[in-house]
Amino acid sequence: EPPGPEQRVVRRAAEVPGPEPSQQEQVAFGSGDTVELSCHPPGGAPTGPTVWAKDGTGLVASHRILVGPQRLQVLNASHEDAGVYSCQHRLTRRVLCHFSVRVTDAPSSGDDEDGEDVAEDTGAPYWTRPERMDKKLLAVPAANTVRFRCPAAGNPTPSISWLKNGKEFRGEHRIGGIKLRHQQWSLVMESVVPSDRGNYTCVVENKFGSIRQTYTLDVLERSPHRPILQAGLPANQTAILGSDVEFHCKVYSDAQPHIQWLKHVEVNGSKVGPDGTPYVTVLKTAGANTTDKELEVLSLHNVTFEDAGEYTCLAGNSIGFSHHSAWLVVLPAEEELMETDEAGSVYAG
């Protein structure tokens, strides 16, 4: 549909750069304008199939967004249409043209919605919220959304661009992309991961000067792992026939652990099966009413010689399994008395 009688059509064109992407062309439109961006090769040479993207995300044609091979039209522009537009070669994804689009008729410093005056005088950029600029290190739990802000002003209204570790930072540089919101002077990254760690710099500039701010992002990760069992537990035990014994197993796990106590047994005189897997019997496992704390203790009452042998605490979660084993030695009561007489000590667990 053609622009209505109230709308202005504002055209911006850019020459296709060489192999090195050129600087973004800074362009401004009024609210309600029809934005028209053109990307033409020098001398009319064909560029091949192209796609248009905004803030690193491919643009889909709609009733308001008209996408052509070398031309993009956005009808009835609003502030949400501000951003970085690029025309890319469809196959190689080489950036052919770069536009940084502002839509005016909004507070020139974006985050100055509190109505404070911004400078009308011509001048270099400055921070409008300097009290927010001193937190340089942000430690963010993985999977959260992080937002860097650099609210600024100047006349003419400055442009803002972002660097990661000193290099130009664009949406295609991270899985999930980024959201560049020029009216808010902000960079948003959703669902951060460890690879997002680094130094992020906003560069705010106009023809009178440039200011920059660097934030360091650390992503706090709790790496998923199989359960960790406390060293030395369960411990080997020596017990007197008929006494009670407790084995302890301390389990650490982020994911919900499943704990079992196993006793190694012999089948036809063999301790292991044909595949080398030990023969075991399950003594204790999670039930409807058992707590993790209860499962961390295996109690044996009135032990017999048959109870002697190897016991294993097995803990598993969604990541994997861990196990620790200990031995129980059962001594006859007479031996206990003899040892007491000779050495003055008792072999008791």
Epitope: R129, P130, E131, R132, Q184, E190
Partner: antibody, heavy 119, light 107 residues
Framework: EVQLQQSGPELVKPGASVKMSCKAS????????MHWVKQSHGKSLQWIGY????????NYNQNFKDKATLTVNKSSTTAYMELRSLTSEDSAVYYC????????????WGQGTSVTVSS | DIQMTQSPSSLSASLGGKVTITCKAS??????IAWYQHKPGKGPRLLIH???TLQPGIPSRFSGSGSGRDYSFSISNLEPEDIATYFC?????????FGGGTKLEIK
Amino acid sequence: EVQLQQSGPELVKPGASVKMSCKASGYTFTDYNMHWVKQSHGKSLQWIGYINPNNGGTNYNQNFKDKATLTVNKSSTTAYMELRSLTSEDSAVYYCARERDYDGSMDFWGQGTSVTVSS
Amino acid sequence: DIQMTQSPSSLSASLGGKVTITCKASQDINKFIAWYQHKPGKGPRLLIHYTSTLQPGIPSRFSGSGSGRDYSFSISNLEPEDIATYFCLQYDNLLWTFGGGTKLEIK
């Protein structure tokens, strides 16, 4: 554990001033902006402003610029809000809340200080 | 300022049931919305931030969704301790604004 402990209820006369406190513990006080929010009876919450405890910088809602003054004492990890020229319209519960540094939401709140303005 | 219109202002539901509360912003808030539970005499408790991210320690019975100007918050499998007032907060810009609150009662 992050905790924000606010001072007790206040009964003040019209025209007077009141200064309430918000004692922070369980985190590095100077690392997070502290916000103040007003809850009048039967009305939705209103944002008053925030202070950066590290540099003392403030940002006020225009509607409260002449009403509230935000300050901090770094050594006691306490934020303060003073309200002046009180009227019955200022009767409300006032909350302090910590701003999460990486996105701007308010993640921990005090239990509130009730202010009643009455002659 | 961005206005946040929250509805309903009150609702009653049965234990084990599900309730949904909505907040509509006067302009696009780019998913920067948080939801809080508020009980008398206590400070509000953050449940969800950035539209749908659950705070650590908050049960998955609580959920949020939305984009642009329209956002919703739900509690499923209602429990007695869910009786409270719930409100939304937009923090898209540097002028924080709140919804009017929804008082939840159990039938």
